[in-house]
Interface confidence: medium
C-alpha cells in the first residue's frame, strides 16, 4: 500500500495526544468552575473537532467555530475583563491573583485552546501531527488563527464597563495594530456597553522612568478608541514585580507609593 | 519530601478481591493526575489505569478494564484501586504515581510498590 | 509483546556511549511525546527523559533523549558503573487510548 500523501505546512504539528488534552481541560475546568458545571465536555469536544476535522486546514473560518462558541458561551461580570498583548504571562499572573478578573485564557474556550496547536487534512479523520499550517509561510485561515480569531472578537464584543489592557512596554511598538487585541479586540468593544478602555503599560527596565503613556503608539491607540466613542486611560507600571506583590498584598506600607 | 505510600497488597485466589491503597505527601495532591502501573515478576512496566484530578477522566488498560477500578479521595491525599475477580496473570509488584499528564511532565515521582500474588 | 519495541539488551565500559532504541507506530511514538525511564533492580521507576528530550532537574546531561518518526532513542554518554539497570520507553497510544511501555532495555556496564 503506497502511503497517501500529506501537506508538509512550514508550522509545527497538532499538540501530542491533542483530544485527551481538549477533554482533561475541559472537565477540570467545569470542575472548578460551578456556573460551567451544565457543559458537556464530549459534546464540546465534538464541537471543537467539528470545526477543523476533515477541512482543508488553510480555509476555515469563524463560521466553523460556532457551534463550539456556542457551547461555550460565558458572561464576564462589567469592569473584570482583562485583554492583553505580547505579555500573556504577567496578566495571567495577575488575574490568578486578582481573581475576580478575567483574561481570555481564564474562560472555558481560551483554557482549553491556551498553548496548543491543531489541524486536520482535508477528506480524512485524521489529525495531522506532523505540521499545521503557519500564519506568515502559510496562510492566515489556518485553524488556529481563525480559532483565536473568533472568541477574541466575541470575548471583546461581551465585554463591559471599564475594559483593562496589558501592554509590554519593552516592545517597540507597545500599541500594535496587527496583534489580536489591535486587529480584533479594539474593534469589537461595543460603545453602548463599553465606557472606557484603560491600558496598563508594563515597563521592562528597572530604572526606567520614561511614560511610556506618551508613546506614538499610545496615541494611535487612544486615537482609535476615543473615535469609537469609548474614553481612554493609560497608566504605567514601572515595577510589575511590585505591583503583582500589591495585588497580593494591598495593605503593605510600600504599596502606598507608586508602582 | 514528596513520598507515595502503597500499601493493601498480599496473597489472594483466583477471582478473589483486593484493595490497594497510596497514600500521598509532600505535594498538593488535588493538583495532580494519578496512575497505576504493574510490574509482573521478571518482566516489564505494564500501564494500569490514570485518574484525573476530580476523578471525571478515567482510563483503563484492556486487561484490566471492568474489573478494576482506581479511585481517589483528595481529602485523605489517597488514591486506590479496587481489584476484582483477579487472576494469576494480575500477580505483580504494583506502583502508584504521580503524573503530570497535562503538562506532558510525565510520571514523575513513584512509589515503592506493593506485591500482589494471586495464586490458589 | 509489548507495543514499542525495545532490544532486550545492551552493554558497554565506563566512559563509553551508548544508546538505545525505542521503534513504535504513528499513533504512538510520532504522533506523541516520548518518556523514558531508568529502574534500578529491586527499586521504582525513576523518570529520567519527558516531551522526547526533555532532562527532569536532577538528571544528569549524560542522559539525553531524541525521536525521529516512529522511533525514538535514549543515549547516556560518559557510562558509570551506577547506570547499569533497565531502561523503559513509554508514550500514549492514540488509537489505543492508553500508555504503553516498550519491554525494556536491560544495560550491562562491563
Known amino acids: 500500500v503506497l502511503p497517501r500523501w500529506r501537506q508538509q505546512w512550514s508550522g509545527s504539528g497538532t499538540t501530542s495526544r491533542f483530544p485527551e488534552t481538549v477533554l482533561a481541560r475541559c472537565v477540570k475546568y467545569t470542575e472548578v468552575h460551578p456556573e460551567m458545571r451544565h457543559v458537556d465536555c464530549q459534546s464540546v469536544w465534538d464541537a471543537f473537532k467539528g470545526a477543523f476535522i476533515s477541512k482543508y486546514p488553510c480555509n476555515i473560518t469563524e463560521e466553523d467555530y460556532q457551534p463550539l462558541v456556542k457551547l461555550g458561551t460565558q458572561t464576564v461580570p462589567c469592569n473584570k475583563t482583562l485583554l492583553w498583548s505580547r505579555i500573556k504571562d504577567l496578566a495571567h499572573q495577575f488575574t490568578q491573583v486578582q481573581r475576580d478578573m478575567f483574561t481570555l485564557e481564564d474562560m472555558l474556550l481560551g483554557y482549553l485552546a491556551d498553548d496548543l496547536t491543531w489541524c486536520g487534512e482535508f477528506n480524512t479523520f485524521e489529525i495531522n501531527y506532523q505540521s499545521c499550517p503557519d500564519w506568515r509561510k502559510d496562510c492566515s485561515n489556518n485553524p488556529v488563527s481563525v480559532f483565536w480569531k473568533t472568541v477574541s472578537r466575541r470575548f471583546a464584543e461581551t465585554a463591559c464597563g471599564v475594559v483593562h489592557v496589558m501592554l509590554n512596554g519593552s516592545r517597540s511598538k507597545i500599541f500594535d495594530k496587527n496583534s489580536t487585541f489591535g486587529s480584533v479586540e479594539v474593534h469589537n468593544l461595543q460603545p453602548e456597553k463599553v465606557q472606557a478602555l484603560e491600558a496598563w503599560v508594563i515597563h521592562g527596565g528597572r530604572e526606567d522612568s520614561r511614560d511610556l503613556c506618551q508613546d506614538p503608539t499610545i496615541k494611535e491607540l487612544e486615537s482609535i478608541i476615543s473615535k469609537r466613542n469609548i474614553r481612554f486611560f493609560c497608566k504605567n507600571i514601572y515595577r510589575p514585580d511590585k505591583f503583582l506583590q500589591c495585588v497580593k498584598n494591598p495593605e503593605d506600607s510600600s504599596c502606598l507609593s507608586g508602582i | 519530601e514528596v513520598l507515595l505510600l502503597e500499601s493493601g497488597g498480599g496473597l489472594v485466589q483466583p477471582g478473589g478481591s483486593l484493595r490497594l491503597s497510596c497514600a500521598a505527601s509532600g505535594f498538593t495532591f488535588s493538583d495532580y493526575w494519578m496512575s497505576w502501573v504493574r510490574q509482573a515478576p521478571g518482566k516489564g512496566l505494564e500501564w494500569v489505569s490514570t485518574?484525573?484530578?476530580?476523578?471525571?477522566?478515567?482510563y483503563y488498560a484492556d486487561s484490566v478494564k471492568g474489573r478494576f477500578t482506581i479511585s481517589r479521595d483528595n481529602s485523605k491525599n489517597t488514591l486506590y484501586l479496587q481489584m476484582n475477580s483477579l487472576r494469576a496473570e494480575d500477580t505483580a509488584v504494583y506502583y502508584c504515581a504521580k503524573d503530570n499528564w497535562n503538562d506532558y511532565y510525565g510520571m514523575d515521582v513513584w512509589g515503592q510498590g506493593t506485591t500482589v500474588t494471586v495464586s490458589s | 509483546q509489548s507495543v514499542l519495541t525495545q532490544p532486550p539488551s545492551a552493554s558497554g565500559t565506563p566512559g563509553q556511549r551508548v544508546t538505545m532504541s525505542c521503534s513504535g507506530n504513528?499513533?504512538?511514538?510520532?504522533?506523541?511525546?516520548v518518556y523514558w525511564y531508568q529502574q534500578v533492580p529491586g527499586t521504582a521507576p525513576k523518570l529520567l527523559i519527558y516531551?522526547?528530550?526533555q532532562r527532569p532537574s536532577g538528571v544528569p546531561d549524560r542522559f539525553s533523549g531524541s525521536k525521529s518518526g516512529t522511533s525514538a532513542s535514549l543515549a547516556i554518554s560518559g557510562l558509570q558503573s551506577e547506570d547499569e539497570a533497565d531502561y523503559y520507553c513509554a508514550t500514549w497510544d492514540g488509537s489505543l487510548k492508553a500508555r504503553v511501555f516498550g519491554g525494556g532495555t536491560k544495560l550491562t556496564v562491563l
Open positions: 485518574i484525573s484530578i476530580s476523578a471525571g477522566i478515567i
Open positions: 516531551k522526547d528530550d
Open positions: 504513528n499513533q504512538n511514538i510520532r504522533d506523541n511525546y
